[in-house]
Structures are given as C-alpha cells and as structure tokens.
Amino acid sequence: MPACCSCSDVFQYETNKVTRIQSMNYGTIKWFFHVIIFSYVCFALVSDKLYQRKEPVISSVHTKVKGIAEVKEEIVENGVKKLVHSVFDTADYTFPLQGNSFFVMTNFLKTEGQEQRLCPEYPTRRTLCSSDRGCKKGWMDPQSKGIQTGRCVVYEGNQKTCEVSAWCPIEAVEEAPRPALLNSAENFTVLIKNNIDFPGHNYTTRNILPGLNITCTFHKTQNPQCPIFRLGDIFRETGDNFSDVAIQGGIMGIEIYWDCNLDRWFHHCRPKYSFRRLDDKTTNVSLYPGYNFRYAKYYKENNVEKRTLIKVFGIRFDILVFGTGGKFDIIQLVVYIGSTLSYFGLAAVFIDFLIDTYSSNCCRSHIYPWCKCCQPCVVNEYYYRKKCESIVEPKPTLKYVSFVDESHIRMVNQQLLGRSLQDVKGQEVPRPAMDFTDLSRLPLALHDTPPIPGQPEEIQLLRKEATPRSRDSPVWCQCGSCLPSQLPESHRCLEELCCRKKPGACITTSELFRKLVLSRHVLQFLLLYQEPLLALDVDSTNSRLRHCAYRCYATWRFGSQDMADFAILPSCCRWRIRKEFPKSEGQYSGFKSPY
C-alpha cells in the first residue's frame, strides 16, 4: 500500500462481490442453518437471561442451634465402672467458630485430672521400649504427648514405655465410643439467618421474610423456604446416616443458592437450599477420618493447676452462599447479539465446504466415474468456477504455451536450464471460454470480408498436409515455419517454441491469423480504439503495430488477460509478425516478464 494517501482515500468503502447460486438444495441448507442458529440464539438469550447484567451475591450468615441431649457416660472410679447420666445443652455441644460455620459435638473422649509432671507414655509402637537405649532425652516425636527424659520405665505390668515430661496421665489412644454419646443430636435444629446484597443493582433481601411460621421445619418439597433445619434431615438428603457420621465426626455443607431475576416484570429472588457432604468418607484409619479436635477445661486443685482434656468429635456445618442477581442491560443484549452474529456464517462455511469438496479433482477422478447417484454433484464444478478465480503467482519463471493441435494450454513455471520451451511438458490448464462479445469491438472489415477468390466460403481448416520443413527450420520446429532465435545463448531456449506439438500445418497459414494478427487495418483500429488521436512516425508505428499484433495473438490463443500477459508466442508467429512489421535496425528484444 502506498505510504502517502490523499484525503479521497479516506472516504472510501470496500464491499465484497458475491456469487448468488440459485439452488434448491443449497437454499434449503442455508435456511436450515439460519433457523437452527436463530432458534438456539433466542433460546439461550431467554433461558440463560443473557440480556441481563449479572452480579455475584454478597452475604452474611448467622446461625442458632437448639436442642437438648442426654448423655450416658461410662467412667472408671476407684477401679469400678460407673454409668453417669448428664444433660448437654447448646452451650455444652456448640463451639464458637469463625466464618459461615457452626459446630455440633456428637461424641467425645475425656482424660480427667491431668497435671504437668513426669510419667510413662501411653503404649504405642513408637513409645514401647525394652531399654533406655530406645528413648532419647529431649526427643519430641510429633505423635508424642511430651518431651522424653531418656528413661524407659514401666507403664503397666511388664509393658515399658519411654518416660516423658507432659500433662499426665497421658491421653489414651483409643477409638471413639460407639454408638456416639450425643447420638440424639440428630434431632437438634438450626435456624439460618442469611442477609444478601447486590450493591450494583442496589438490592437487599434476606431468607426469612416477615410473616414466616417459625415453628416450621425445612422439607425439600413440602417446605422448601423454611430456614429451620433438622440435622438428621440434612444427612438424609445427602444419603448419609447421621448415627454413623456422629461417631467420628464430619463436615457437611449447607448450600444457599440465590438466582435472582431483578427485572420488574419477572421479579424473583428466593433462596434454594441444598446439602453436600464435604469430608472424605472413604478415608482409611491412617489418614484420620472424620472431624475432631481437642480442648481443655482448666481448674486448680490443692493449688496445682489441672485440666480435663476432651477430644471432641462432631460435625462442622459450612454454610456456602452463592448466586447471582441479574437485571436487564441494553449493553449486555447488544454484546450478546454481536457475539452470535458470526454463527450465521456457518451456513456459508458449510456450503462452501460442500462446493469445494464436490468440485475437487478427487471427486472428478475417483467418485463420479463409478457412482451414478453422485452425478448430480458435478454441478458443483460449475459453481466453483463461478465462485473462485484461481491466480498463479507471477514468478519470473511463469510462462504459458498454446499449441494449435492441443485443446488445453500448458503452464510452465520452472527454469528452462537450456532446454527448448517446445520440449518442456508443463502443467495442463483448461483454455478459458471464448468471450465472443470482444469480437464486436473489432472493425466491420473483419466480420464481412468478401470471400477470397478460389476458396470455398465454409470455415477454412488448417491445411491437413504438413508444410515441408525448410532447411533453415530448427530441430524443435513442427510446422516448418520457425526460425532460429537471435537472442543470446542463455535466453535462446525461451523462443524455441513452435505453434504445434506434432508435425502439421502452421497457424500462420490460417485465414484468421492473417485477419486478426497481421491486418494493419485491424491493428490500427485497435491502437486508435485505445488512443483516438494517436499519430506516429513510420518506425514507431511499426513498433506499436508489432506489439499490438503480439498482444492480439496472445489474447486470441490464450483468452484470459492473465494468461496473455505471460504468453510465449511461437517462433513462427513471432517471425511472421516481425516480417509484417519489421524493426528498421537493431535486434528484437524478445519476451519480458510484465512483473
């Protein structure tokens, strides 16, 4: 593109030239695609509310757990097992948690009367020892409950363990009680208060609306808007058994989904509750299944600080609030429509693919000859020709050759390397269809020339018999009228071309050659047609007529303007034209690539 541009270049508009194919099949395919795409676009627009500007929810949660549990604990007092009944209320079984979570204790293990002193470790694989060598002073094992003194002491009977400085007696490594001590927590209820806000839409609401019956209990179908949940029901919804989970503890998700349509004409903004087990129920024993933690109750006895260590098992409920609020927005609608417009081009892509496929050489040579039902598809070759214009890259090596005894044109796109152009095979290219309208521009003399005496008025064919080869005609000449090239050795092979591939009459002997190419009257008409006020001296006139004759021959024999630009004239034609319109002095320059 040129570097400088004028003001008029700015005020331009380019558009594509299209080919309209009148075809029932392709018309049906086009409308089928358009209808399907339009239906999908409209469906997606409405169902996904893509005309809305959506904003994520901002939320706060507050919970209250209610319920009383009776616990039967088995304790050992002075070597005697006793069953102790105790009542647990909200303060006993819930613990303050950060974030949108609450915890309900379902099981526990107590180690009472711990104080800081030296004592043997609880026997485990890591703490059992046979001598002091199995313990190390100052060693702190991550699994241990204290700091080793380096001594191996008797724990009980003949069992010896490493002595530690710790809260003694050491907590026993034992399984959580079965069934869970607070198994009745299944009947506890939790009230969830959830306030939400969509600041971008200036809209606030909550899950508890005025007039709600607060004696309700959530039910998936019968009471889906009730914010009071029975813990056992939550587990039933996820397909888990509360009593099983209560033993080791677990994590349960309560999901509150707000899908709010804030448009006045379709306003809807209510929560949907769902539940999901969040801990891994398949975890093996070595990876600490369930959910537990330890906490201690500290007290003083005889001025000695003591504690009761409680390993608490329970269920942590995580409340997960998510969702969006959407409101009509013209920009979103325009953006969506813009993003879907490209889909309507799919029909064109698909139909072009069919035309290109069915007009390929593969179909022509391998499918159409054998498959009779595929024959109607041949029409695609016609569509393809109308749709596509093939252009060959105009390399310096590009040349077109036309033999009078061949129906096609040969494209030679290679260096000759000393070989005669006559002998180079090249690639066969179909001859462009003759546009007879061009003939109407020629002078009338060409159309109604009186018959030449002694010749019949029918179309004259080239004389069948071969013109006897003159002694001067080169080896590559087949018509007997060619002359050797006068160009230097390196360029000579370009002019070593005959008008025929096989021996026969020369094209220069045809009447049409004389009328189209050699007629001074026609050539002058063509030159004046281009430049009406052309006035030239004899030598320059000859030069103009000669080049016009070359052009006439190229256009006549090659048809397409693009091919004519790269057409190589046969030697016989070239020399016949030069004979008619000679150069007064100097050598003829020969073919030059136009680009």
Epitope: R125, R126, S130, G134, K136
Partner: nanobody, 129 residues
C-alpha cells in the same frame, strides 16, 4: 500388607561367612525400614542390624564390625552379610519391616522390636565346628 521370606541360613564353621536374604512382597518396599533380629533357644529376641528407608544403619553391640546390612529396592530385598561368625551367633534370624510412609523411624528406635509391624518366619543359622 507385607510378606517377608528369609533365606540363606545353614551350618557354618566358626570364623566362616554367611549371607542372609529377606525378600519382601509389595510395591512400597522402599518406604519400609528393615531390620534383622535373632533369638537363641531360651533367650529373648535380640536386635542384630537395621536399615531405614533412606539408608541409615544401626547394629547391635555384639555384631558391630562383623555384620553388614544392605538393601536392594529394585529387588525388594534386604541382605545381612555375616563375617567372622562365632558359636554364640547360633540362633533363628528374623527379618522385620517398619512402615515409614507416614514418618521416618528415628535412628535410636531402629533397634526396638516394637517398631516393626511385619515379621518373617525366620531362618536358622548354626555356627559349629
């Protein structure tokens, strides 16, 4: 679950050498600390040698300098090379394995029989002229 099979035991003259092998089943062999223990008739089981999953070794006081423990993880096998054997080395030799997947066994604990979860059937070594 790991199965351990000892081999290489037999009768040997004092001052002689013997090489015991212990083949372990299971793909996680490289995560186990392996040990050799022995038990003479009427005596307690005694620590001989051990090698952790990361290659550190420990030997019983009575065998230091004479016995060498090694392992070949590609063959899932642990070896005990016994040189300069004495009549008091006569015993049933047991191979043992301790899982170190969730944490390494401290070096000072390698000699503790309590650390080892899996045990072989034993192979008899008799040192006699």
């Amino acid at each position: 679950e790991v199965q351990l099979v000892e081999s290489g035991g037999g009768l040997v003259q004092p001052g002689g050498s013997l090489r015991l092998s212990c083949a372990a089943s299971g793909r996680t062999f490289r995560h186990y600390a392996m040990g050799w223990f022995r038990q003479a008739p009427g005596k307690e089981r005694e620590f001989v040698a051990a090698i952790s999953s990361y290659g550190s070794t420990d030997y019983g006081d009575s065998v230091k300098g004479r016995f060498t423990i090694s392992r070949d993880n590609s063959k899932n096998t642990v070896y005990l090379q016994m040189n300069s054997l004495r009549p008091e080395d006569t015993a049933v030799y047991y191979c043992a394995a301790a899982d170190e997947t969730l944490g390494a066994v401290p070096n000072f604990r390698l000699h503790e029989k309590y650390e080892y979860e899996y045990w072989g059937q034993g192979t008899l070594v008799t040192v006699s002229s």
